[in-house]
């Protein structure tokens, strides 16, 4: 039975040209995290594997940095980066947990972080 929950940074906003950290946290389970996949809509951005370490998709290498922790840092943001991001936690023995973050990249300097929220 899957008892864990994914806590994410929720809906967040950032300035064009700036950077943002995408963070998810798995709690309420003793399952072992074996791999975390980060996706942007229909693109695989990066993978963090407990044994193999990080793999950043080559097409994103210039603008995506691993970490902190299992999170992902997006740099040199453009308006096209606006959209949904997903952290997919592969765990044993529970299975797969998915968290969602919505990022809005703003032209103006008024960029506020949204509240944290949980996805069961």
């Amino acid at each position: 039975m899957m008892t864990g929950t994914i806590e994410t940074t929720g809906n967040i906003s950032a300035e064009k040209g700036g950077s943002i950290i995408l963070q998810c946290h798995l709690s309420s389970t003793t399952a072992q995290v074996t791999q975390v996949n980060w996706e942007q809509q229909d693109q695989l951005l990066a993978i963090c594997n407990a044994d193999l370490g990080w793999h950043i998709s080559p097409s994103f290498k210039d603008r995506v940095a691993p970490g902190p922790g299992l999170g992902l840092t997006l740099q040199s943001l453009t308006v096209n980066d606006t959209g949904e991001y997903f952290c997919i936690y592969h765990t044993y023995p529970d299975g797969t947990y998915t968290g969602r973050i919505f990022l809005e990249v703003l032209e103006s300097s008024v960029a506020e972080h949204g509240a944290r929220f949980q996805i069961p």
Epitope: Q35, L52, Y92
Partner: antibody
């Protein structure tokens, strides 16, 4: 240098059994998912089974479920495929393939031929 | 199960031609799509992984694109050693599935 070497293929009668082995070298075997993929004569590629690096979770194609068993011995750097209740349609070259991140298969063995015939 | 449909099943081309092979998934697979090359009597060789990432050691004339359900493998300038059969494969979910293959022959 990464190497995968399959063995154990041969001629077997319908209903018989075979165990294929894949000896791995040149990388940390225990850190990678592994797969068996087969190719019938003149046909395309068909994934048969896979095993995760960490949990040892096993996955099978419907066509072999209940008849084939994938396993690994990390201490021997070896992947296995136990094949029971073999049928004529199992005749194929069987490849083992390394699966980093369980997303792609970057290294393949040379294959071993299994022929099921009376 | 996710079905992978490749087209064309075969094509004839000349050295220097630009060749495009398409692969369609029966449901969205994000970018969990890989391309392999196989020559007669040989094991498959990984060309492109995660839809668009070029495997180390593979010539840059090979490129991949697409996401969701529609994907493309392009060979920008066909070379004599590129005559082979090409397969797409999804790794979005098990069972992993391959396309039926595209045989690239000399015109």
């Amino acid at each position: 240098e990464v190497q995968l070497l399959e063995s154990g293929g041969g001629l077997v009668q319908p209903g018989g059994s075979l165990r294929l082995s894949c000896a791995a070298s040149g990388f940390t075997f225990s850190s990678y998912g592994m797969n068996w993929v087969r190719q019938a004569p003149g046909k395309g590629l068909e994934w048969v089974a896979g095993i995760k690096y960490s949990s040892g979770n096993k996955y099978y194609a419907d066509s072999v479920k209940g008849r084939f068993t994938i396993s690994r011995d990390n201490s021997k750097n070896t992947l296995y495929l136990q094949m029971n209740s073999l049928r004529a349609e199992d005749t194929a070259v069987y490849y083992c393939a390394r699966g980093p991140y369980d997303v792609w298969m970057d290294y393949w063995g040379q294959g071993t031929l299994v022929t099921v015939s009376s | 199960d996710i079905q992978m449909t490749q087209s064309p099943s075969s094509l004839s081309a000349s050295v220097g031609d630009r060749v495009t092979i398409t692969c369609r998934a029966s449901q969205s697979i994000s970018s969990y799509l890989n391309w392999y090359q196989q020559k007669p009597g040989k094991a498959p060789k990984l060309l492109i992984y995660a839809a668009s990432s070029l495997q180390s050691g593979v010539p840059s004339r090979f490129s991949g694109s697409g996401s969701g359900t529609d994907f493309t493998l392009t060979i920008s300038s066909l070379q004599p050693e590129d005559f082979a059969t090409y397969y797409c494969q999804q790794s979005y979910s098990t069972p992993l599935t391959f396309g039926g293959g595209t045989k690239v022959e000399i015109k």
